[in-house]
Every structure is written in C-alpha cells, then in structure tokens.
Amino acid sequence: AFGISGVQKYTRALHDSSITGISPITEYLASLSTYNDQSITFALEDESYEIYVEDLKKDEKKDKVLLSYYESQHPSNESGDGVDGKMLMVTLSPTKDFWLHANNKEHSVELHKCEKPLPDQAFFVLHNMHSNCVSFECKTDPGVFIGVKDNHLALIKVDSSENLCTENILFKLSET
C-alpha cells in the first residue's frame, strides 16, 4: 500500500479554481472497493504498478487513492439538452505522480507516471448510478466505464442505460 504525503485525511476544498476544469474543486483520500466489497489494491512489480481486485484479510490495511474532482462544462451542442450542463470528472492517483489511465485500445486500466496537465485518458466522468456507489466513465470514450473483469480492472462498454447499474462497474468510496 502507498501513502500519499502532504494530503489531508479529509476532503480539502481548494480556492484557486479560477478556471473550470483546471484546478480540482476538491480532493479526497479514500479506499476504493467493488460493489461486492473486494478491495482495489496496487503493487509495484518489475518497476511497474499492477492493479488488483482482491479480498483483504481481516486486519489488512486498504490502499488509498487520491481522488481529485474537477468541474467540467458540457456545452449544449454536445448535451442535446439545449442548455449548458456541468459534470464532475475525477482523476485517481494511488501514489505520487501516478494516475489511473484508460487504455482504450487494450480495454485496460493502467497506472502511468505523468506530469500535469494530465492527459484526457486520466479523466473519468463520475456517475452516481446506484445507492452510494459510483461509476467512472472514460472521458475519451463515452459509454466505456472502469469495471472489474477477472480480478483486474478493465474498460467495459455499457450499451444502454439499463446496464449502468450492473455490479461490475459500481464502486464504493470509503475513508476506512
């Protein structure tokens, strides 16, 4: 498990957000687990990070992820609603300078080291699709979500709104 230095335990509201989408509106350190309460863990293997979905032993400490929340304007010509809307996007960083990335070609979720500004592949649209669960939709590939496949995180195409509540794309955020 990785610690993230200099991050407050609780959410920190940032006041330097002069341009929507550039600075996070808030940051939150949380553990990530699946709908079925398996933990998302991160391990350094052969100088690269691997992401696992696993059951933790009773007193095993959960890995924490820094979630940075960004407010994104969604222009009316894209929304189809005739009005500009706002949505929340997140980046997820389990350790300093590394962020979850969507690899749309491989349908995989990977940890990449990168500097800010982060590429679009590191941003995910946040959905509350089920009671107290969230889903993460790829900014670069609408309709594709982070999901669980064979005890790993993968990118999963969701074909219709009825499938937005399927358990394998639902995650829980917890401080503990």
Epitope: A13, T26, S79, G82, V83, V125, S161
Partner: antibody, heavy 121, light 107 residues
Framework: QVQLQESGPGLVKPSETLSLTCTVS????????VHWIRQPPGKGLEWIGV???????GYNSALMSRVTISVDTSKNQFSLKLSSVTAADTAVYYC???????????????WGQGTLVTVSS | DIQMTQSPSSVSASVGDRVTITCLAS??????LAWYQQKPGKSPKLLIY???RLADGVPSRFSGSGSGTDFTLTISSLQPEDFATYYC?????????FGQGTKVEIK
C-alpha cells in the same frame, strides 16, 4: 429553458395513496437525477427520494416502506406515490433536478414551484 | 443516515451585518454539502454547492467553507433581500438529509 412542474390532487384522504407527477422540460431524465422533497407547513425540508439518471431509485429510510418513484421518459415525467397517508404527510411537495450530469454531489439547482397536498377526510 | 445539525435556529441581524450559519454532519461528508435560501411561499434556491462553490447568479457576499463534518455559510454584508431561511444539505450519501434550517430575521 429548464422547468419542472408538479401536478396532482391537492386533497387526499387518510389511508389512501398520494400520487404526484413532475413534468420536466429543457433537459433529459437520462442524464440528470431528479428528486422529491417535501415541506410540512411551517417546518423544514425533508428529502423523500431520488430517481437517478441510470434509472435506479433511492429513498428516505423513514418513508421507504410507503414510497415509490417511477419514470415515464416518453412523457418527460416522473412520479411519486406515497401510500397509507396520514395528516403528518400534509406538506408542500417539490420536485428538483441535480446540478451535475449523472451525479447528486452538486445539490439541486432547479426546483418546481411546489404543490400543497393536504391529507384530510 | 447522516444527521445534519444547523445552528443557530434563528438569528436577528441588521442590514450590513456579517452573518454566519454553521452546519455539523454526524459523519464525514467530504465537500459534498449544499446551502439553500428559501423565502416564504417560494421554492428553495441553491446558493452554494460542493461546500465552497457559488451557484450561478448568486451574489459574492455569500460564501461557504468547511469540509469533513464542519461547514459554514457566511453572508458578509446582509442585504434586505437576504432575510430568509437557510438550509444545509449533505449529498455524500443517500438519503440526502437537510439541516433543520436557520431563519435570518430583521433585528
């Protein structure tokens, strides 16, 4: 522009079912969560429940056994049903829409004007 | 369920006064708190969301602060149109509970 409009009977008898409809325009129910909130005369706001963009629902635990929220996307409407009502359910009932696409984290930016429902025989 | 406790329940103030309303959550809710203003016979109006973000069209004399469990709404210089009831609401987890309200009255 975005609008929400509540409609339904203003008077319901005790033990019957309260039924309200919220008709929306200017946005898609497939993209935004919508909520029912009520306010008894002279009292505070009470959240009743949500219909999320993905179609799932969530309810106030104190009302859960009596409340149902459903949607008719073809009519741009969502509905509230509250069964076995008593005088304590007398309130102004509001429908409201989330601030953010797909997420309730940003609060409710658009509200209907509210409709008073009185429970009395 | 998360309980939201607002204080004070009412406050008497004059035009130009600085008014502070607090909201305490029974468990941590991150930054997911909204503040609403409601005038008699009217629907609530969103003032602040995500604890600190000013909603569109809301005057800059309104500001929000706090995170975790403790939150504050401040009106820096009270105007005649600000006399109303103010509610906080947590949006971290369903059910999305409201505080009991704070009535700002003319002194």
């Amino acid at each position: 522009q975005v609008q929400l409009q509540e409609s339904g009977p203003g008077l319901v008898k005790p033990s019957e079912t309260l039924s309200l409809t919220c008709t929306v325009s200017g946005f898609s129910l497939s993209k935004y969560g919508v909520h029912w909130i009520r306010q008894p005369p002279g009292k505070g706001l009470e959240w009743i429940g949500v219909l999320r963009a993905g179609g799932s629902t969530g309810y106030n635990s104190a009302l859960m056994s009596r409340v149902t929220i459903s949607v008719d996307t073809s009519k741009n409407q969502f509905s509230l049903k509250l069964s076995s009502v008593t005088a304590a359910d007398t309130a102004v009932y509001y429908c409201a829409r989330d601030h953010y696409y797909y997420s309730s984290y940003g609060g409710f930016v658009y509200w209907g004007q509210g409709t008073l429902v009185t429970v009395s025989s | 369920d998360i309980q939201m406790t607002q204080s004070p329940s009412s406050v008497s103030a004059s035009v130009g006064d600085r008014v502070t309303i607090t909201c305490l959550a029974s468990q941590t809710i991150g930054a997911w708190l909204a503040w609403y203003q409601q005038k008699p016979g009217k629907s609530p109006k969103l003032l602040i969301y995500a604890a600190t973000r000013l909603a569109d069209g809301v005057p800059s004399r309104f500001s929000g602060s706090g995170s975790g469990t403790d939150f504050t709404l401040t009106i820096s210089s009270l105007q005649p149109e600000d006399f109303a009831t103010y509610y906080c609401q947590q949006l971290d987890s369903s059910p999305y509970t409201f505080g009991q309200g704070t009535k700002v009255e003319i002194k």
